[in-house]
């Protein structure tokens, strides 16, 4: 908290400009004006102030703004976001995506910060959906975001949305996770071509149920073996030897080398043994 | 609902076989989605995992104790058996049957019983 | 093999606090990794089962994350109940391994 004093003559800021830096904190107190501070804080990214003095910048802009700042104050604070709580983001109502990637241009190279969780939040909230233009942004920064979600708030997300995932998005997610996004990429990519439909769905299918992959298998899509190994265990077991067989195409070879991982083990372990001994790569069941 | 019980004798002589058994109660030991297994814990040390049977007679070993495992499965008994050949004193420990659920993992455990070798 | 690293190796802590245990995998096991309570005298017992589901009857207090190599077991809010030691286990890998352990004690 820096002490009310009054501001030296010919110190009162008319603009913000560079020669600010050479203010002290309670000068900058003193003698810059909160509302000038709110009108030209798209000058303040520019100014290498201290993170001393970025605190009486901040504290400045929280006087004038108790209950939370304006988005147009908001699109210009830049590195000031760095100083910001999460309680901070709360009090906002952040609307703009212009907004939204201007700030997390400010924490780009970053490991998501409490803040910016908190800013995605309040974003999402407040269009009450994530959109395939918001996911696209948020993917583009954060490529695990939306493995982030829980399976509750993967709900919101639109089918329309699915559109936006690139495979590395949802390489953290869990089998809880692609189980609430598979029916929504199936809805989105329903109207595609066999091998278009089965190149936009395999990242999503560590959620698909067992009727699905029988169905895949009668479409010569050749499915590779790390794709096999992110299957729900449970839509795996029921699959005969032979569907197994098309499903995977000349991967199939590839079940050989994981015979001892899951979910191959426990399919192999449910399989008769005459069937296993047709595919001619010494499984024991 | 699905119970364990282990049962054999609680000491064996060093360069013997140690034999327990387990029996299921509650549900049954050919059940599609379980296989069963046998867990050890030394006195104040950690699990070690021992093996695993399927109904259907297969079986999976702990590499490191392959050699002198055998686990078996008896469908008309609802049990399976744990044989440990040649064992030691590093062989004392609580020995668990578990079933192993899968889609969870060790889900329902016996209460143990206490092997202890020594001549 | 695939060896599971737990850590700490013990913790002392307090009624309330939130406690964090880590287990790490010698190689990737995807989200195939469980968490198990033992009580002194007694079995293990369940807790999370595919990395971070919730196995029934357990408090939701209790809860996993984490894939491939690294995983966690939080404990939001230590009751009394929950001093015990707690092991990691991976089912993906035939050799089914247990972490060493992780006691939690009274501070």
């Known amino acids: 908290e820096v002490e009310k004093t009054a501001c030296p003559s010919g110190k009162k800021a008319r603009e913000i400009d560079e020669s600010l830096i050479f203010y002290k904190k309670w000068e900058l107190e003193a003698c810059v004006d909160a509302a000038l501070l709110a009108t030209q804080m798209d000058r303040v990214n520019a100014i290498p102030f201290t993170y001393e003095q970025l605190d009486v910048l901040k504290h400045k802009l929280d006087e004038l703004y108790p209950q939370g700042y304006p988005e147009s104050v908001i699109q210009h604070l830049g590195y000031l976001f760095l100083k910001m709580s999460p309680e901070d983001i709360r009090k906002w109502n952040v609307t703009s995506l212009e907004t939204l990637k201007a700030l997390l241009e400010v924490n780009k190279g970053h490991e998501m910060s409490p803040q910016v969780a908190t800013l995605i939040d309040r974003f999402v909230k407040g269009r009450g959906q994530l959109d395939k233009d918001t996911l696209d942004t948020l993917t583009a920064f954060y490529p695990g975001y939306l493995c982030s979600l829980s399976p509750e708030e993967l709900s919101s997300v639109p089918p329309s949305s699915i559109w936006a995932v690139r495979p590395q998005d949802l390489d953290t997610c869990d089998p809880r996770q692609l189980d609430v996004l598979y029916p929504k990429a199936r809805l989105a990519f329903q109207n595609m071509n066999g091998s278009e439909y089965f190149v936009k769905i395999q990242s999503f299918l560590g959620g698909a149920p067992t009727e699905d992959l029988k169905a895949l298998s009668q479409q010569n899509v050749s499915m590779d073996l790390a794709t096999f190994m992110k299957l729900r265990t449970d839509a795996v077991l029921p699959l005969t030897v032979a569907e197994v067989q098309k499903l995977l195409g000349p991967h199939v070879e590839g079940l050989k080398a994981e015979e001892r991982h899951r979910p191959v083990r426990d399919w192999i372990l449910r399989q008769r043994q005459d069937d296993l001994d047709t595919l001619g790569l010494g499984l024991q069941g | 609902q699905v119970q364990l019980q282990e049962s054999g004798p609680g000491l064996v002589k060093p360069s013997e076989t140690l034999s327990l058994t387990c029996t299921v109660s509650?549900?049954?030991?050919?059940?599609?989605?379980?296989?069963w297994s046998w867990i050890r814990q030394p006195p104040g040390k950690g699990l070690e995992w021992i093996g695993y049977i399927y109904y259907s007679g297969s079986t999976n070993y702990n590499p490191s104790l392959k050699s002198r495992v055998t686990i078996s499965v008896d469908t008309s008994k609802n049990q399976f058996s744990l044989k440990l050949s040649s064992v030691t004193a590093a062989d004392t420990a609580v020995y668990y049957c578990?079933?192993?659920?899968?889609?969870?993992?060790?889900?329902?455990w016996g209460q143990g019983t206490m092997v202890t070798v020594s001549s | 093999d695939i060896q599971m690293t737990q850590s700490p190796s013990s913790l002392s802590a307090s009624v309330g606090d939130r406690v964090t245990i880590t287990c790490r995998a010698s190689?990737?096991?995807?989200?195939?990794l469980n968490w198990y309570q033992q009580k002194p005298g007694k079995a293990p017992k369940l807790l999370i089962y595919?990395?971070?589901s919730l196995q029934s009857g357990v408090p939701s207090r209790f809860s996993g994350s984490g894939s491939g190599t690294d995983f966690t077991l939080t404990i939001s809010s230590l009751q009394p109940e929950d001093f015990a030691t707690y092991y990691c286990?991976?089912?993906?890998?035939?050799?089914?391994?247990f972490g060493g352990g992780t006691k939690v004690e009274i501070k």
């Open positions: 509650g549900g049954s030991v050919s059940s599609y989605y379980s296989t």
């Open positions: 595919a990395a971070s």
């Open positions: 286990q991976q089912p993906y890998d035939a050799s089914y391994t």
């Open positions: 190689q990737s096991i995807s989200s195939y």
């Open positions: 578990a079933r192993d659920n899968v889609f969870t993992g060790f889900d329902i």
